[in-house]
Interface confidence: medium
C-alpha cells in the first residue's frame, strides 16, 4: 500500500567517513518529497530532513551519540505540496536502510603526516590525530580517542633514490624508524583497524619526502 503518484525510495546507502555519516538514496524526486527517520535497536524513531527534495540526509548528529550502537533508517515518500495526503491504507510509502554500526563500518579517512624529524639515523614520523564529530563532555574526540588501540597506522617508507618500500606499524600516532645517514626518505601512512571485517583500511596519505618543506630535518 502507499500513496498515489509517489514512488518508494530505493538504493538506500550509508556514506560515512570518520563518523561523518550521510544516508543517500534514489530516485531524484518528481512531485514528491522525503522525510528520513533513524533509530537504534534500543531507541526510537527520530525524524530528520523533513519534507526534503534532496536525496541525502546528514545523520551525523544522531549516530555520534553512540557510535557502537546499530542504527536503522527509513525514507518516507510524500506527494509534494500535500504531505498529509496518504494512500488508501493511510500510510506513506517508505523503505528501510541496511543496518549501520558506525564503529564497525565508518570509513577511515585519508590520514595526514603531521611532521617528521630526523635525529642521526632515526626518524620520528607523526601522524595527525584527526578530529571526529564524536563528542564527549562538549569536546570533539580524535580518531585515536574513539578507537583507542583498535586503530593502528602502517608506515610505508623508501629512499627517494629507490623504489623498495619498507613498512612499520604503530598503535600510537608516532613511528620511530632507522634510516641510512645522508639518505632522503619518502613516507606514506595508512590507518588500519585489524579487527574489522569491512572497511579495514584507509586510503594512503599523501606522500611526504625529506628535504621538502614538511617536518623538520636535524642531523646531529
Amino acid at each position: 500500500s502507499g500513496t498515489t503518484n509517489t514512488v518508494a525510495a530505493y538504493n538506500l546507502t550509508w556514506k560515512s567517513t570518520n563518523f561523518k555519516t550521510i544516508l543517500e538514496w534514489e530516485p531524484k524526486p518528481v512531485n514528491q518529497v522525503y522525510t528520513v527517520q533513524i533509530s537504534t535497536k534500543s531507541g526510537d524513531w527520530k525524524s530528520k530532513c523533513f519534507y526534503t527534495t534532496d536525496t541525502e540526509c546528514d545523520l551525523t548528529d544522531e549516530i555520534v551519540k553512540d557510535v557502537k550502537q546499530t542504527y536503522l533508517a527509513r525514507v518516507f515518500s510524500y506527494p509534494a505540496g500535500n504531505v498529509e495526503s496518504t494512500g488508501s491504507a493511510g500510510e506513506p510509502l517508505y523503505e528501510n536502510s541496511p543496518e549501520f554500526t558506525p564503529y564497525l563500518e565508518t570509513n577511515l579517512g585519508q590520514p595526514t603526516i603531521q611532521s617528521f624529524e630526523q635525529v642521526g639515523t632515526k626518524v620520528n614520523v607523526t601522524v595527525e590525530d584527526e578530529r571526529t564529530l564524536v563528542r564527549r563532555n562538549n569536546t570533539f574526540l580524535s580518531l585515536r580517542d574513539v578507537f583507542g588501540k583498535d586503530l593502528i597506522y602502517t608506515l610505508y617508507y623508501w629512499k627517494s633514490s629507490s623504489s623498495g618500500k619498507k613498512t612499520a606499524k604503530t598503535n600510537t600516532n608516532e613511528f620511530l624508524i632507522d634510516v641510512d645517514k645522508g639518505e632522503n626518505y619518502c613516507f606514506s601512512v595508512q590507518a588500519v583497524i585489524p579487527s574489522r571485517t569491512v572497511n579495514r583500511k584507509s586510503t594512503d596519505s599523501p606522500v611526504e619526502c625529506m628535504g621538502q618543506e614538511k617536518g623538520e630535518f636535524r642531523e646531529i
Partner: antibody
Framework: QVQLVQSGAEVKKPGASVKVSCKAS????????MHWVRQAPGQGLEWMGM????????SYAQKFQGRVTLTVDTSTSTAYMELSSLRSEDTAVYYC???????????WGQGTLVTVSS | DIQETQSPSSLSASVGDRVTITCRAS??????LNWYQQKPGKAPKLLIY???RLHSGVPSRFSGSVSGTDFTLTISSLQPEDFATYFC?????????FGQGTKVEIK
C-alpha cells in the same frame, strides 16, 4: 535495576495545568527515550509523546500537540510531562515509560492519577 | 493513525485452557507489534515484542505470531496469575497506538 518513580496524585480544576515528574534510575538516562502514556478510568492506553533526553528532541501525538510539553532535567535524571488547559476528560492515570526499541515500552513508572474536577 | 482491533474484547477461561487473542492492524506495521499485560491498579508489563520475541522473565507459556495482518498472542496453559487485561501496541509508525484491550476472566 531500572526504576521509574513518578510524583503523587493531583487534583486540578478545569483550565489549570498539571506537571508530573518521573525520576529514572538504574540506567544511563540520556541513552533511552522517555514516553508518556495515559489511561482514563476503565479505558485503554493512549500514547501522548516522547522525548530524547540526550537533546530534548520531542515528538507528540497530534491530539496533544500544543497542550502537552515534555522536558527533562539530565542533572537529576528526571522527565516531566506538563498538560495545560485541563478538562474533565483528562482525568486519567499518566505513566512514564522508557523506550527500549522503536515504540517498545519495557519499563513503566507506577502511574500518577490526575483528577480534573470543578 | 494506525488502529489495532483486538478480539475478543473479553473472554472467560479456566486454568489450564489454551487462550488466543488476536490483534489486526489497519495498515502495514512490519513486525513492530508488542503485547502487554495489565492488572487492576498496576502499570502494564511487556510480554512479547517484535511480534514473537519473549521479554526477559516472561514465562514460556506466552507466545506471539503473525499471519498476514493478524497478530496473535497465545497462552498455552492459562495460570491463575494470567487473569488480566492484555493490550497489543504497534511501534512502527508515529503516533504509537494500542488496541482497546482484551479482558481474560475466570470462568
Amino acid at each position: 535495576q531500572v526504576q521509574l518513580v513518578q510524583s503523587g496524585a493531583e487534583v486540578k480544576k478545569p483550565g489549570a495545568s498539571v506537571k508530573v515528574s518521573c525520576k529514572a534510575s538504574g540506567y544511563t538516562f540520556t541513552t533511552y527515550w522517555m514516553h508518556w502514556v495515559r489511561q482514563a478510568p476503565g479505558q485503554g492506553l493512549e500514547w501522548m509523546g516522547m522525548i530524547d533526553p540526550s537533546d530534548s528532541y520531542t515528538s507528540y501525538a497530534q491530539k496533544f500537540q500544543g497542550r502537552v510539553t515534555l522536558t527533562v532535567d539530565t542533572s537529576t535524571s528526571t522527565a516531566y510531562m506538563e498538560l495545560s488547559s485541563l478538562r474533565s476528560e483528562d482525568t486519567a492515570v499518566y505513566y512514564c515509560t522508557r523506550g527500549s526499541g522503536p515504540g517498545l515500552f519495557a519499563y513503566w513508572g507506577q502511574g500518577t492519577l490526575v483528577t480534573v474536577s470543578s | 493513525d494506525i488502529q489495532e482491533t483486538q478480539s475478543p474484547s473479553s473472554l472467560s477461561a479456566s486454568v489450564g485452557d489454551r487462550v488466543t487473542i488476536t490483534c489486526r492492524a489497519s495498515q502495514g506495521i512490519s513486525n513492530y507489534l508488542n503485547w502487554y499485560q495489565q492488572k487492576p491498579g498496576k502499570a502494564p508489563k511487556l510480554l512479547i515484542y517484535h511480534t514473537s520475541r519473549l521479554h526477559s522473565g516472561v514465562p514460556s507459556r506466552f507466545s506471539g505470531s503473525v499471519s498476514g495482518t493478524d497478530f496473535t498472542l497465545t497462552i498455552s496453559s492459562l495460570q491463575p496469575e494470567d487473569f488480566a487485561t492484555y493490550f497489543c501496541q504497534q511501534g512502527n509508525t508515529l503516533p504509537y497506538t494500542f488496541g482497546q484491550g482484551t479482558k481474560v476472566e475466570i470462568k
